[in-house]
């Protein structure tokens, strides 16, 4: 309940999670259909199957070959016409696509599950968090998070710790040591710099986030765990 | 005459070439823009190969806000009066929390803080109303009949609600609906 520095003015972006997984599965990209059409046109332009035999025959009948400059101009003219049509089509199509749910800026799009985090996870400052309700040992928690394609909760800074502490109960974090003679390390093997309370107790070799501070605990005890996935 | 014709065709070819090039570059720019604007990332489902697009702003909340189930929430750490809280939320183009159901904030059901929410008593309608004017469902807070109508409501995400003086200072939750 103590007053803390307001963070109201520092607003920028964290993603909303719910809308993942509701997207039609087939398309890799929402514009694939249209873009395939556009690219089809472009590909056709790269190898224009313009049948010049007819033209050649006319010239042959007259006993004359057309100057190459004229042929080039004709080909370029046709390419110009096709390109012009493609450009116009594209100009018309893009706003149409945007109006029809394909744009991330439309309200309809926002109803979808966007893909930042799995459903029922929360997003905060470019990370996804799984808020666990079940209790596990530290090792079981580590495995549970791995199976969710994420890591056991890590604390990157004081601000994140304050935020998490305000909404979560005690939770395992991804920090441990082999014994009280060894340094605290993260699950990535990096040295952990922050102070961990009760580090002098040889039986307590796994770390817990507990209301605004970090403390050591018995790795075999059961605690709630949370997972984190950086975006 | 033949030379003149050749020169003319060359001129036409050159002009058409330039037009073609400019059309090609226009098309390229249009396509690039359409790609950037329209691409939507694949769903992040718990599974082996997760590909995340960092730069997409789709369904995103402001920094320091929490995204959950199509909504953005600002969970304050500072304590304010009910009116101050309401104005702070409004200044962020949001409103004090309006609950759809008691498990809406189940991601923070372990929190033991009470937060101001956007519920106040309307003498005119003789009912507890949310900020958008809709009435409080009698199923949301079974104890709401005992609330003092002069007070404002502080809510704990565990489902508890208290009526307290609107001049009291509590933390607060702002909400932005993305749909």
């Amino acid at each position: 309940m103590n007053k803390q520095r307001g963070t109201f003015s520092e607003v920028s972006l964290a993603q909303d999670p719910k809308r993942q997984q509701r997207k039609p599965k087939g398309n890799k990209s929402s514009i694939s259909g249209t873009e395939q059409e556009i690219f089809q046109v472009e590909l056709n332009l790269q190898n224009p199957s313009l049948n010049h035999q007819g033209i050649d025959k006319i010239y042959d009948c007259q006993g004359l070959l057309p100057p190459p400059e004229k042929l080039t101009a004709e080909v370029l003219g046709i390419i110009c016409i096709v390109l012009m049509a493609t450009v116009l089509k594209t100009i018309v199509l893009i706003p149409f696509l945007e109006q029809n749910n394909f744009s991330p800026n439309t309200r309809t799009q926002k109803a979808r599950h966007c893909g930042h985090c799995p459903e029922e996870w929360i997003t905060y400052s470019n990370s996804c968090y799984y808020i666990g309700k079940e209790r596990r040992t530290w090792e079981e928690s580590l495995l549970a998070c791995t199976s969710k394609n994420s890591s056991l909760l890590s604390i990157d800074n004081e601000e994140e710790m304050k935020f998490l502490a305000s909404i979560l109960p005690s939770s395992w974090i991804g920090v441990f040591r082999n014994s009280s003679h060894h340094p605290w390390v993260t699950i990535n093997g990096l040295a952990f710099k922050h102070k961990i309370k009760d580090s002098d107790n040889a039986e307590l070799n796994c770390a817990v986030l507990q209301v605004n501070r970090l403390k050591s605990a018995q790795c075999g005890s059961s605690m709630i765990y949370h997972c984190k996935h950086k975006l | 005459m033949a030379v003149f014709k050749t020169t003319l065709w060359r001129l036409i070819s050159g002009t058409l070439g330039i037009i073609c090039l400019s059309l090609m570059s226009t098309l390229g720019i249009l396509l690039k823009n359409s790609f950037t604007k329209l691409s939507i990332e694949p769903a992040f489902t718990p599974g082996p190969n997760i590909e995340l697009q960092k730069d997409s702003d789709c369904c995103s909340c402001q920094e320091k806000w929490v995204g959950y189930r199509c909504n953005c929430y600002f969970i304050s750490s500072e304590q304010k009066t009910w009116n101050e809280s309401r104005h702070l939320c409004a200044s962020q183009k949001s409103s004090l929390l309006q609950l759809q159901n008691t498990d809406e904030l189940d991601f923070m059901s372990s929190s033991q803080q009470f937060y101001w929410i956007g519920l106040s008593y309307s003498e005119e309608h003789t009912a507890w109303l949310w900020e958008n004017g809709s009435a409080l469902s009698q199923y949301l807070f079974p104890s709401f009949e005992t609330f003092n109508t002069k007070n404002c409501i502080a809510y704990n995400p565990n489902g508890n609600a208290l009526d307290e003086s609107c001049e009291d200072k509590n933390r607060y939750i702002c909400k932005q609906q993305l749909i």
Epitope: M1, N2, S170 | Q113, N160, S165, C166, E167, K169
Partner: antibody, heavy 120, light 107 residues
Framework: EVQLLESGGDLVQPGGSLRLSCAAS????????MHWVRQAPGKGLEWVST????????YYADSVKGRFTLSRDNSKNTLYLQMNSLRAEDTAVYYC?????????????WGQGTLVTVSS | DIQMTQTPSSVSASVGDRVTITCRAS??????LAWYQQKPGKAPKLLIY???SLQSGVPSRFSGSGSGTDFTLTISSLQPEDFATYYC?????????FGQGTKLEIK
């Protein structure tokens, strides 16, 4: 360092009145709810009353409702408990306690207590 | 009102023992529970809050667990200074209520 110092405890006759004070220091007083808890001689702890940080809302145990009034003066960092219509069963050591920052329903710092004796 | 029942009401133990005190709520209180230690003539001291969070400055031999209606305070290895009376308290709703206390005595 958080300090809570109660005063005002005394021997009073049934039906009489007493005003207890609790002077707080070492923390930002107006950020926290405050409580009174009492303990009858040789008995357990009993919650008496709670006041919110700005003093706008008070909560009372049924046993004291209508007789006790809790207030605070944030400018003086002081908590008051006005006790009227005192009864023999109000005899106890009265502790003033600070609310925990994690949740106001926990009492993280206590005063040393002041003894109120109601007897004829 | 929520009733809090502590068991046992008293327990005798020796230094180095592991001691467990239980507290039961008459209705679910999630994890809104605290444990206090009180020595004769002194004010109570907060040990555990939110069922399992250790209050700052409290030795790690004290731990709390439980949720809903059943809660436990454990002292892993009893020290001479731990002989006192222990109370549980629910903070889920007004009126806040305490257990009747468990007196921990030297065997």
């Amino acid at each position: 360092e958080v300090q809570l110092l109660e005063s005002g405890g005394d021997l009073v006759q049934p039906g009489g009145s007493l005003r207890l004070s609790c002077a707080a220091s070492g923390f930002t007083f107006d950020n926290y709810a405050m409580h009174w808890v009492r303990q009858a001689p040789g008995k357990g702890l009993e919650w008496v009353s709670t006041i919110t940080n700005s003093g706008g809302t008070t909560y009372y145990a049924d046993s004291v409702k209508g007789r006790f009034t809790l207030s605070r003066d944030n400018s003086k960092n002081t908590l008051y408990l006005q006790m009227n219509s005192l009864r023999a069963e109000d005899t106890a050591v009265y502790y003033c306690a600070k609310a925990h920052y994690y949740a106001r329903g926990y009492f993280d710092f206590w005063g040393q207590g002041t003894l109120v004796t109601v007897s004829s | 009102d929520i009733q809090m029942t502590q068991t046992p009401s008293s327990v005798s133990a020796s230094v180095g023992d592991r001691v467990t005190i239980t507290c039961r709520a008459s209705q679910g209180i999630s994890s809104w529970l605290a444990w206090y230690q009180q020595k004769p003539g002194k004010a109570p001291k907060l040990l555990i809050y939110a069922a399992s969070s250790l209050q700052s400055g409290v030795p790690s031999r004290f731990s709390g667990s439980g949720s809903g209606t059943d809660f436990t305070l454990t002292i892993s290895s009893l020290q001479p200074e731990d002989f006192a009376t222990y109370y549980c308290q629910q903070a889920n709703s007004f009126p806040y209520t305490f257990g009747q206390g468990t007196k921990l005595e030297i065997k």
